[in-house]
C-alpha cells in the first residue's frame, strides 16, 4: 500500500531559523500537500511535478523546495512563533495517504530550554503549553487573510 514517510518527527528551532521537512513516497502521486493541522487544517503548500507550486500567502517568500513530488524536501525560512504547529504531508493518490506529521516548535531564543522534542512521533492533538508569562499566537488565527473570492457565475 502507498504510504508517506515524513521526517523529522519533531524539531525545536529559534525564531528566524529554518526547518526542513521531507516527504517521501513510493511514487504514483498526483501531487502532495503540506498542511498545518488544527481545528481548521490549513494548506501550506501544494506541489506537483511540472507545475508552479502554490503556497499559502503567510509563507510566500519563506519556502523553498528541492527534489520531486515523490521525494520532496520543503524548507521553511524565517520562522515565527506563530508558525509553531504540526505539519503533515498528504499525498494525492486514489486513496488519502498521510505522513506521520512534524511538530515544529518555534521558540524565543531565551526560552530554548523550555521544551525539547522527544523521540516519539508528534500527536496532532495538542501542542505543549506555552511557558508562563508568554503566549504563542494560535497558528490558525495568526495566518494571513485568504485570497478574496474569485468571481464566478452560474451557467
Amino acid at each position: 500500500a502507498q504510504e508517506v514517510q515524513q521526517s523529522p518527527h519533531c524539531t525545536t528551532v529559534p525564531v528566524g531559523a529554518s526547518v526542513n521537512i521531507t516527504c517521501s513516497t513510493s511514487g504514483g502521486l498526483r501531487g502532495i500537500y503540506l498542511r498545518q493541522l488544527g481545528p481548521q487544517p490549513q494548506d501550506i503548500i501544494y506541489y506537483e511535478d511540472g507545475v508552479v507550486p502554490t503556497t499559502d500567502r503567510r509563507f510566500r517568500g519563506r519556502i523553498d523546495f528541492s527534489g520531486s513530488q515523490d521525494n520532496l524536501t520543503i524548507t521553511m525560512h524565517r520562522l515565527q512563533l506563530s508558525d509553531t504547529g504540526t505539519y503533515t504531508c498528504q499525498a494525492i493518490t486514489e486513496v488519502n495517504v498521510y505522513g506521520s506529521g512534524t511538530l515544529v516548535l518555534v521558540t524565543e531564543e531565551q526560552s530554548q530550554g523550555w521544551h525539547r522534542c522527544s523521540d516519539a512521533p508528534p500527536r496532532a492533538s495538542a501542542l505543549p503549553a506555552p511557558p508562563t508569562g508568554s503566549a504563542l499566537p494560535d497558528p490558525q488565527t495568526a495566518s494571513a487573510l485568504p485570497d478574496p473570492p474569485a468571481a464566478s457565475a452560474l451557467p
Epitope: 498526483r30 501531487g31 494548506d43 502554490t54 503556497t55 488519502n96 485568504p146 473570492p149
Partner: nanobody, 122 residues
Framework: AVQLVDSGGGLVQPGGSLRLSCAAS????????MSWYRQAPGKERELVAT????????NYEDSVKGRFTISRDNAKDTGYLQMNSLKPEDTAVYYC???????????????WGQGTQVTVSS
C-alpha cells in the same frame, strides 16, 4: 482554462440508475469541495449532495438519501454522482460545482459545470 465538464445524463425509466461524472481541468481539484446541484423546469436550483476535499465526509439532500452516492477521485480530477432507484421527480438538469473551503490554498474560488440533463420517465 478552468473547466468542469458534466456528463452521464440521459433518459432512464423509473427505478433505473445513472452515474454522472464531473471532470475538472485547469485547477487543482483536490483543493475544492465538490457538490452536485439540480434544477427542474420552473424551479430553483437545489443542492443534492456535497463531498469534502478528500472524501472524508459527504452530505445529501433528504429526498435522495439512500439512493444517491457522491464520490470523487482526486488522482483523476473527477467527481461522481451514482443515482439509483430514480424517480420522475429526479428529472432535472444536474450541475457539478467545485468550491474551495476555508483552509484551502484556493479559498473562495468557485466553479460550475455546464449541466447534464437527467430525465426519468416511462
Amino acid at each position: 482554462a478552468v473547466q468542469l465538464v458534466d456528463s452521464g445524463g440521459g433518459l432512464v425509466q423509473p427505478g433505473g440508475s445513472l452515474r454522472l461524472s464531473c471532470a475538472a481541468s485547469g485547477f487543482t481539484f483536490s483543493g475544492f469541495a465538490m457538490s452536485w446541484y439540480r434544477q427542474a423546469p420552473g424551479k430553483e436550483r437545489e443542492l443534492v449532495a456535497t463531498i469534502s476535499r478528500f472524501g472524508e465526509s459527504s452530505n445529501y439532500e433528504d429526498s435522495v438519501k439512500g439512493r444517491f452516492t457522491i464520490s470523487r477521485d482526486n488522482a483523476k480530477d473527477t467527481g461522481y454522482l451514482q443515482m439509483n432507484s430514480l424517480k420522475p421527480e429526479d428529472t432535472a438538469v444536474y450541475y457539478c460545482n467545485a468550491e474551495a473551503p476555508a483552509g484551502s490554498l484556493w479559498y473562495g474560488n468557485n466553479y460550475w459545470g455546464q449541466g447534464t440533463q437527467v430525465t426519468v420517465s416511462s
